[in-house]
Amino acid sequence: NECPELQPPVHGKIEPSQAKYFFKDQVLVSCDTGYKVLKDNVEMDTFQIECLKDGTWSNKIPTCKIVDCRAPGELEHGLITFSTRNNLTTYKSEIKYSCQEPYYKMLNNNTGIYTCSAQGVWMNKVLGRSLPTCLPECGQPSRSLPSLVKRIIGGRNAEPGLFPWQALIVVEDTSRVPNDKWFGSGALLSASWILTAAHVLRSQRRDTTVIPVSKEHVTVYLGLHDVRDKSGAVNSSAARVVLHPDFNIQNYNHDIALVQLQEPVPLGPHVMPVCLPRLEPEGPAPHMLGLVAGWGISNPNVTVDEIISSGTRTLSDVLQYVKLPVVPHAECKTSYESRSGNYSVTENMFCAGYYEGGKDTCLGDSGGAFVIFDDLSQRWVVQGLVSWGGPEECGSKQVYGVYTKVSNYVDWVWEQMGLPQSVVEPQVER
């Protein structure tokens, strides 16, 4: 009652290994690391056979098949490259995830290398079986912003891609009778969030109550250059409109708000986020130069009353930008205190502009980002949001533009976006 000699499968072994096997002897077939027992197209870790009374084995010896991790999972905003020839996905094969550069960067500078494990799963040394995360790169336009040595007099046309974070926010309040329509600017912070001024998203009421406009009445355009041609732009509706809870219409203190987009927008050369600053109560240093872009008034001779009475007719078709220095806080406070009207410049604001005038932000630029280049991180950082200005026409002598000091609100912004600080480290100015 002796059974025939057994040959272990290729890449496998049989235990116990004996010279002879008799009735009722049992053997266990197993495979080397990275291989699985395959019997009747069923994968298993081990397979047992027995020597029968009639001197035959209860089953044929199974084969050992190399473990296959199969096609790796898709990475949002990422790519996969196979390190092994023929795009193999079997044991010890290697793949590399990378993010769609230069628009996305891998969180925590992960290598992105995954190896097919003996268990049949793609494994990374740090993340295990979890996929990496591609976060939007911020503050790095595909087109270089101009040198900040030479001063720009007045505004000039922005080339497409120069301000890829620039958003046009259009509010059409159909709940009003008659319908009300206005617009402002904003800055893209991530694929789903826009930073802007609260006064842009406050319902334009006949009283001083602060009520946000309904999200249904907000449309955001990104990647827009010429307002006459919106075909190349990405337009998105709003999922949420969040005004700072302490926004005060009487002095525009806490003039900051967020719009969450209905769907994340695809990033590209004309649509990229700007970086948020570090939490810094001082804000930008005096005399630092920053850039502001907008579709607001570009004619310095137009008075505020003319702008208001003519509606949107005096707006720029092409995105304009201007370079402005930060004004010392005391100087700005003094310049406004000397004016009639309640013009308090609070610690949540800073001023920018030139004593002699001629360059300024104006109506319609509201909510746009005042960006400063950070030498350390080599990124553009949103330090201000266009908030308000004096009673005289824009660009008047000794009338500085006033901006919301974004660095005072970094924690509030992250909190609203629902992202822990650790996850968003690449977004923060380093």
């Epitope: 009003r176 006949r206 009283d207 109550t209 309640n342």
Partner: antibody, heavy 114, light 112 residues
Amino acid sequence: QVQLKQSGPELVKPGASVKLSCKASGYTFTSNDINWVKQRPGQGLEWIGWIYPRDGTTKYNEKFTDKATLTVDVSSSTAFMELHRLTSEDSAVYFCSSVEDSYWGQGTLVTVSS
Amino acid sequence: DIVMTQSPSSLAVSAGEKVTMSCKSSQSLLISRTRKNYLSWYQQKPGQSPKLLIYWASTRESGVPDRFTGSGSGTDFTLTISSVQAEDLAVYYCKQSYNLYTFGGGTKLEIK
């Protein structure tokens, strides 16, 4: 077209309460607050308070905080004002208005008498 | 609280005449940031509900005849009817909306 239709006249006894209604139609009810205004016979207008139907936020004239309670029923686009502990001083016409006073109800006369 | 004072309390004019009435507030109703004065004017004809004529001190409500003009800023405001018509017989109220709402006592316009 926009309409605010108020409930009919009320004759109530001193010390009692009364609940007035204001049914809105023809506009976005939740996006526009409802104001309530009092006018005693031969007198001027007095603002009582407002309610914002989207979230139920209310604001009151201090004088009326203990006198009036404002509520809404969004499902029927109706605003309500309940007046408590009525006295002869509360005898007046009460108006509701909306879309920032662009539209007014016809008024409800409340007479407090024993 | 903001107190609104209207004057005169009543006036009588002939049809076709120009009429002005005044409204003064106990504090400024101008918000520099919005460049708006938070003051409205209302007309209430006998036995009717009030009707909004002017908001933000000078913006005419749609459908209001252009003979009605609002002006002023800060604490002093004026409603002008350039050529009074018989149907303008009414009480005119101003209202501040700078801090909650307060109505003035009204100006009664009578036609001679």
